[in-house]
Amino acid sequence: LRLLDHRALVCSQPGLNCTVKNSTCLDDSWIHPRNLTPSSPKDLQIQLHFAHTQQGDLFPVAHIEWTLQTDASILYLEGAELSVLQLNTNERLCVRFEFLSKLRHHHRRWRFTFSHFVVDPDQEYEVTVHHLPKPIPDGDPNHQSKNFLVPDCEHARMKVTTPCMSSGSLWDPNITVETLEAHQLRVSFTLWNESTHYQILLTSFPHMENHSCFEHMHHIPAPRPEEFHQRSNVTLTLRNLKGCCRHQVQIQPFFSSCLNDCLRHSATVSCPEMPDTPEPIPDYMPLW
């Protein structure tokens, strides 16, 4: 988790002098509770936005927006703590809005935004806005949270972001898998415009089960420049196991930008359709 590097972070707006500060996620009001505390944020909204760094890279960011309730507690509102927790790693990053002037009621509802938390594709985050000072131990909570799921690199808008492109999102291998005679599969896919090797991972399963009955790995050497964007055809030999008929073919590239952590593409071949009617049993059994 990190903040987007561009521009000084600003939270001031007409009628309010405000500064954005790094935060330890442990506001002083936890340790030294105050008697009077503000009410919670209203209408917390989170959207996925995209922002360029000074270097021109494009990153997905969480755009966080909320409003204040129209009650007298804004007189005691000293700021806000914005917290983003990445759920699969428990990593947390916080910033603090510090109000340098007192808020006054005005004709429009107070609204705040922040769009500088960089988020990763296919990750889930808990986004929390805490008004400051935080409440006394038994006080009503004055925060709002939402669990926000970022689309993965298959998403059209995510595909062109720097983290997705670095993991090979622009490569579309257009995999085709064909079952041949004599227990073989022909796998065909389009090579990318980089001289890097690929790996085909074959996993076979019984018709209705999810534990594998056959696994095979096939290495494809790095193509020459004249082979870029051409189709690569590979024939894989299957194990002659009755019922081991559902095949998942996964292609793993090793692009220089993502090495062994590139996006993989896969295709599945289903088991052949079983005939609806059973084979007829003959009326008589030959004796020889």
Epitope: Q45, I46, Q47, K146, N147, V150, P151, E154, H155, A156
Partner: nanobody, 126 residues
């Protein structure tokens, strides 16, 4: 022009099933999370279920969990709600709604719903 057109509502007995459909047009359907929201007679709006852009994440209100199934077909720009074990309290006008922003939130929407269908009426009565 964004359009969301619901269908599939009707009168059904308690314990019965219905499948609602929503045909979307006028926007890139597979960019956005979609939701079902219902308006119960004499009450306010209630969020029912949501689905992420690719159908990989689903979420349901507690009142419909294990009875309703949300799904989508991005190739057909369509959203669905399979409603099973229907109860009298499911009687409502059901709306198909589009999330304004990109991303998906559990327990409701991340942002506002910027487009709504006209609704399809579901009546559960014996």
């Amino acid at each position: 022009e964004v359009q969301l057109v619901e269908s599939g509502g009707g009168l059904v007995q308690p314990g019965g099933s219905l499948r609602l459909s929503c045909a979307a047009s006028g926007f890139t359907f597979d960019d956005y999370a979609m939701h079902w929201v219902r308006r119960v007679p004499g009450k306010g709006l209630e969020w029912v279920s949501g689905i992420s852009w690719n159908g990989g994440s689903l979420d349901y209100a507690d009142s419909v969990k294990a009875r309703f199934i949300i799904s989508r077909d991005n190739a057909k720009d369509s959203l669905y709600l399979q409603m099973n074990s229907l109860r009298a309290e499911d009687t409502a006008l059901y709306y198909c709604v589009k999330e304004e922003g990109l991303g998906f939130c559990r327990g409701g929407s991340c942002s506002t719903f910027d487009f709504w269908g006209q609704g399809t009426l579901v009546t559960v009565s014996s």
